[in-house]
């Protein structure tokens, strides 16, 4: 089904695993714990998912409803320009940054913010639902 690619469009998929929220054609996991950016990415990859890559302003607005003032890591990094983990550039929103050393992207209910990648924050994973259900 959607298992071929982490970034494929996920149409008419079954429901999401336990603790994941279905929104549109994807499953989202909002963490309770905190990790640094790399470890958040690792957490998502181990569960056949990826750190949240936001495709457009509409998806961003929908997700922000579930967020608070607390920042969450997403799949966004400044590597010669802000790029999502699927390689696409950030082109539909601005990101606030206070320093050159803040090279990882986070989101809260107010928007996108650059942060130092070592800071432990909550995170959001995104994946396609799978036909066979598992806890992850």
């Amino acid at each position: 089904l959607c298992q071929g690619s982490n970034y494929s469009t996920c149409a008419s998929c079954p429901s999401c695993p336990d603790r994941w929220m279905k929104y549109g054609n994807h499953c989202y996991y909002f963490s309770v714990e905190e990790k640094d950016w790399n470890s958040s990415l690792e957490f998502c990859l181990a569960r056949d998912s990826h750190l949240l890559v936001i495709t457009d302003n509409q998806e961003m607005s929908l997700l922000q409803v579930f967020l608070s003032e607390a920042f969450c890591w997403i799949g966004l990094r400044n590597n010669s320009g802000w790029r999502w983990e699927d390689g696409s550039p950030l082109n539909f929103s601005r990101i606030s940054s206070n320093s050159f050393v803040q090279t990882c992207g986070a989101i809260n209910k107010n928007g996108l913010q650059a942060s130092s990648c070592e800071v432990p924050l909550h995170w959001v994973c995104k994946k396609c639902p799978f036909a066979d259900q598992a806890l992850f």
Epitope: E33, E34, K35, S39, R47, D48, E118, L135, F136
Partner: antibody, heavy 120, light 107 residues
Framework: QVQLQQSGAELVRPGASVKISCKAF????????INWVKQRPGQGLDWIGY????????NYNQKFKGKATLTVDKSSSTAYMELSSLTSEDSAVYYC?????????????WGQGTLVTVSA | DIVMTQSQKFMSTSVGDRVSITCKAS??????VVWYQQKPGQSPKLLIY???NRYTGVPDRFTGNGSGTDFTLTISNMQSEDLADYFC?????????FGAGTKLELK
């Protein structure tokens, strides 16, 4: 109830390899990551890595890459760790552990430990 | 890697004492600290998770606190069955790392 049953003690020669097992009981095997932890006599704990039995995904502590290989056999609900090119530094008790709730690295269930002794 | 430092390798205590075991992280780990108890010849046992939450079945004399880099496990009314090694662990960053342990001994 949840139980992790590890294989028995091993005495192995330097340079050899050893494969130890961790059999899971009392829960759905593919729903919980299996972690492996090393403890040398009278010393602290060292996280080796984990394997997700659902998809085989592994995450190793860099320190143990090339030393430990983690695998699972879903049909028997058993996780394995193979240690290669053994030296005296590898003599230790090795534990498998799961967090059970699956989403946090707090290890609520542990195997009884497998003592590996490397000696000529 | 994040280093978890338990500066006291041994602590002498008496039954009924209030005992505080400290653990310091080399960088901010938020509240992602776990505490374990290990008795000789046994596997570690989970006591505290997320710095301050007592795990199921753990007596309420065990409390954890701290955030950021400094963490404490307190036993409010030391019992003889509490004589053991205590380890802290951080979950903020891979590789997961543990403190070297603090052994509680009778005075």
């Amino acid at each position: 109830q949840v139980q992790l049953q590890q294989s028995g003690a091993e005495l192995v020669r330097p340079g050899a390899s050893v494969k130890i097992s961790c059999k899971a009981f009392g829960y759905t095997f593919t729903n919980h990551f299996i972690n492996w932890v090393k403890q040398r006599p009278g010393q602290g704990l060292d996280w080796i890595g984990y394997i997700n039995p659902y998809n085989g995904y592994t995450n190793y502590n860099q320190k143990f890459k090339g030393k430990a290989t983690l695998t699972v056999d879903k049909s028997s609900s058993t996780a394995y760790m193979e240690l290669s090119s053994l030296t005296s530094e590898d003599s230790a008790v090795y534990y498998c552990a799961i967090s059970y709730d699956g989403y946090y690295e707090r290890f609520a269930y542990w195997g009884q430990g497998t003592l590996v002794t490397v000696s000529a | 890697d994040i280093v978890m430092t338990q500066s006291q390798k041994f602590m002498s205590t008496s039954v009924g004492d209030r005992v505080s075991i400290t653990c310091k992280a080399s960088q901010n780990v938020g509240s992602t600290v776990v505490w374990y108890q290990q008795k000789p010849g046994q596997s570690p046992k989970l006591l505290i998770y997320s710095a301050s939450n007592r795990y199921t079945g753990v007596p309420d004399r065990f409390t954890g606190n701290g955030s950021g880099t400094d963490f404490t496990l307190t036993i409010s009314n030391m019992q003889s069955e509490d004589l053991a090694d205590y380890f802290c662990q951080q979950c903020s960053s891979y590789p997961l790392t543990f403190g070297a342990g603090t052994k509680l001994e009778l005075k």
